[in-house]
Interface confidence: low
């Protein structure tokens, strides 16, 4: 791991973060019925899942642990400059490296700082540069980077040959692994002909390891099991039902646009976040149950949002897969009840990606400055930026670009509790609609 | 001693192609960014393109990017500028330059721009119909 | 992009003057500027990078300074080979972008 600046921040993690408010119930749209011991095993199972991944995502992000930003000019401490820094020709003052465009990872006597790498055509940037920490780059899914030719990603073979059965997916950094069925060996060669091909479908989730899969998969079955007869036996029950079942067997109509004031505000996040107490001691995103991916290949088989829903609903299985549209609850100017959501917006962002997401988001360094300069005090910095943001692009400043730009900085779990308090704060509500829609 | 050398300039009609060559000695070519520089008549200076010292890297001004094309040849020593669809403001005299930060092999660092410290006598390009 | 505004444009000086040029940038470029003269029908010499670093074999007389958005190119006392264009360049970010030149005449 890198070495931090003396006066680095800790990692993101322990951030404040907004306690359960008013959300409106979502419920699935009309399916079959379900049993109701199935039911509750299911969303556990979904809740389990959703903790695993937020726990996952919260480790992924852990290295923010980037330097505290410090002033254009220092003084070198020993003939040395801090991280993110690089010392001036005169050997006298330390000058801060460029975001996103070089960096230093430690106490240097450099007269410059080391250009960040940028990540090829066929890769993802996992993480961006800062001033220090250079880029991090990955291949794109369906490609590899093998050991002996790490200069280019390589497509992963689509299916196993004739007679051999797979064994391990195609990840970032192997192709998929084949093995005859009877002898069990490895096979190495080029895959033959399409037609002779056992294809592999290309939405399965990278695993490394098949049967470390199976063993949690199975554990986390055993542990389903029991806290499902806990919370059975728990004075809980009554309380989850009736929102289990809404959840799992809605009554018909849009769930979308449930009439929230029949509602008692937060009943159902407190019923939520018992359960959630009870599943898994350590934060959780209060998102529905749908299942964020993690960043980074786990070996646990988890469920994809779209394969948590068909596991809910069967007759509706050959559906494409949906985006979920965030829509202002009361029909309401998007960018301006996006505007009054800003104010909360600094605990739900590690300090450390504020500055990267209002350039993802189209801010220049001196607007980045200036507002950094005329907000009221720390806290309140975030707000300026994203106030000169829709100034800036006015009706193109959507909650979907911030969101994007979230996931695009690698910050899940910020966008997950971003998304969730626009939910909550009964300001935005989920509107469905087709992945491709272009709505603000 | 060290020199650039451009040449390919000439007169092209709105709309074709022209390639620009750089030629550069008297240092280790391979471990400096490149870069091309223009200047229209009467005008001030234009940064154009800069292409890194293993061609791993290329970026481009507004005004010419999708249209031009910066690239390196270590093993030839030469830079190049490969310019299509012209237009009547490309017409210029068109500089190659050296970037004054220099790639070492024996640590990872490469620098960024700290200015152009060896320039060519410049080839001249003249757009017109 | 980041403009960069020269000024003035041009400017009549005698033997032995103190000349200042400036350069401002559109937003903060920190200390990532660089100053350059061009005398007619050559090309153009790097002077100072980085604000304030001398090139190898540029006179004494010639000095930098600045930060930010607001820098000063400053000729302590102007000499007859001093005559010529100058040039401030931004490298704090692509597309490397120059000021519009100013153009040190004899008065």
């Known amino acids: 791991m890198e070495q931090r600046g003396q006066n680095a921040p800790a990692a993101s993690g322990a951030r404040k973060r907004h306690g359960p408010g008013p959300r409106e119930a979502r419920g699935a749209r009309p399916g079959p019925r379900v049993p109701k011991t199935l039911v509750l095993v299911v969303a556990a199972v979904l809740l389990l899942v959703s903790a695993e991944s937020a726990l996952i995502t919260q480790q992924d992000l852990a290295p923010q642990q980037r330097a505290a930003p410090q002033q254009k000019r220092s003084s070198p401490s020993e003939g040395l400059c801090p991280p993110g820094h690089h010392i001036s020709e005169d050997g006298r003052d330390c000058i801060s490296c460029k975001y996103g465009q070089d960096y230093s990872t430690h106490w240097n006597d450099l007269l410059f700082c080391l250009r960040c790498t940028r990540c090829d055509s066929g890769e993802v940037e996992l993480s961006p540069c800062t001033t220090t920490r250079n880029t991090v780059c990955q291949c794109e899914e369906g490609t590899f980077r093998e050991e002996d030719s790490p200069e280019m990603c390589r497509k992963c073979r689509t299916g196993c040959p004739r007679g051999m059965v797979k064994v391990g997916d195609c990840t970032p950094w192997s192709d998929i692994e084949c093995v005859h069925k009877e002898s069990g060996t490895k096979h190495s060669g080029e895959v033959p002909a399409v037609e002779e091909t056992v294809t592999s479908s290309p939405g399965t989730p990278a695993s490394p390891c098949s049967l470390s899969g199976i063993i949690i998969g199975v554990t986390v079955a055993a542990v389903v099991l029991i806290v499902a007869v806990f919370v059975c036996k728990s004075l809980l029950w009554k309380k989850v039902l009736p929102y289990l079942k809404g959840i799992c067997s809605g009554g018909g109509g849009d769930p979308e646009r449930v009439d929230r004031s029949s509602q008692r505000p937060g009943a159902e996040d407190n019923v939520l976040n018992e359960i959630v107490s009870i599943l898994q001691p350590t934060q959780v995103p209060e998102q529905e149950m749908e299942v964020q991916e993690p960043a980074e290949p786990t070996g646990v088989n988890m469920l994809s949002p779209g394969e948590s829903e068909h596991l809910l609903e069967p007759a509706e299985a050959e559906r494409s897969q949906r985006r979920r549209l965030l829509v202002p609850a009361n029909e309401g100017d998007p960018t301006e009840t996006l505007r009054q959501c800003f104010d909360d917006f600094a605990d739900l962002v590690p300090f450390d990606s504020w500055e990267p997401l209002m350039r993802k988001l189209g801010l220049m360094d001196n607007e980045i400055k200036v507002a950094k300069a005329e907000a009221a005090g720390h806290r309140d910095t975030l707000y300026t930026m994203l106030i000169k943001w829709v100034n800036k692009t006015g009706r193109d400043a959507s909650v979907h670009t911030l969101l994007d730009a979230l996931e695009t900085l690698g910050e899940r779990l910020a966008k997950q509790k971003i998304e969730d308090h626009l939910l909550s704060s009964g300001k935005f509500m989920y509107l469905e609609g087709n992945a491709d829609s272009a709505m603000s | 001693q060290v020199q650039l050398v451009e040449s390919g300039g000439g007169v092209v009609q709105p709309g074709r192609s022209l390639r620009l060559s750089c030629a550069a000695s008297?240092?280790?070519?391979?471990?400096?960014?490149m870069h091309w520089v223009r200047q229209a008549p009467g005008k001030g200076l234009e940064w154009v393109a800069v292409?890194?010292?293993?061609?791993?890297?290329?970026y481009y001004a507004d005004s010419v990017k999708g249209r031009f094309t910066i690239s390196r040849d270590n093993s030839k020593n030469t830079l190049y500028l490969q310019m299509n669809s012209l237009r009547a403001e490309d017409t210029a005299v068109y500089y190659c330059?050296?970037?004054?930060?220099?790639?070492?092999?024996?640590?990872?660092?490469?620098?960024?721009?700290?200015?152009?410290?060896?320039w060519g006598q410049g080839t001249t390009v003249t757009v017109s119909s | 992009d980041i403009q960069m505004t020269q000024s003035p444009s041009s400017l009549s000086a005698s033997v032995g003057d103190r000349v200042t040029i400036t350069c401002r940038a559109s937003?903060?470029?920190?200390?990532?500027l660089n100053w350059y003269q061009q005398k007619p029908g050559k090309a153009p010499k790097l002077l100072i990078s980085?604000?304030?670093s001398f090139q190898s074999g540029v006179p004494s007389r010639f000095s930098g300074s600045g930060s930010g958005t607001d820098f000063t190119l400053t000729i302590s006392s102007l000499q007859p080979e001093d005559f010529a264009a100058y040039y401030c360049?931004?490298?704090?970010?692509?597309?490397?972008?120059f000021g519009g030149g100013t153009k040190v005449e004899i008065k």
């Open positions: 980085a604000t304030s």
């Open positions: 292409i890194w010292y293993d061609g791993s890297n290329k």
């Open positions: 360049q931004q490298s704090y970010s692509t597309p490397l972008t």
């Open positions: 937003q903060s470029i920190s200390s990532y």
């Open positions: 008297g240092f280790t070519f391979s471990t400096y960014g």
């Open positions: 330059a050296r970037d004054r930060t220099v790639y070492s092999s024996s640590s990872p660092f490469y620098y960024y721009y700290y200015g152009m410290d060896v």
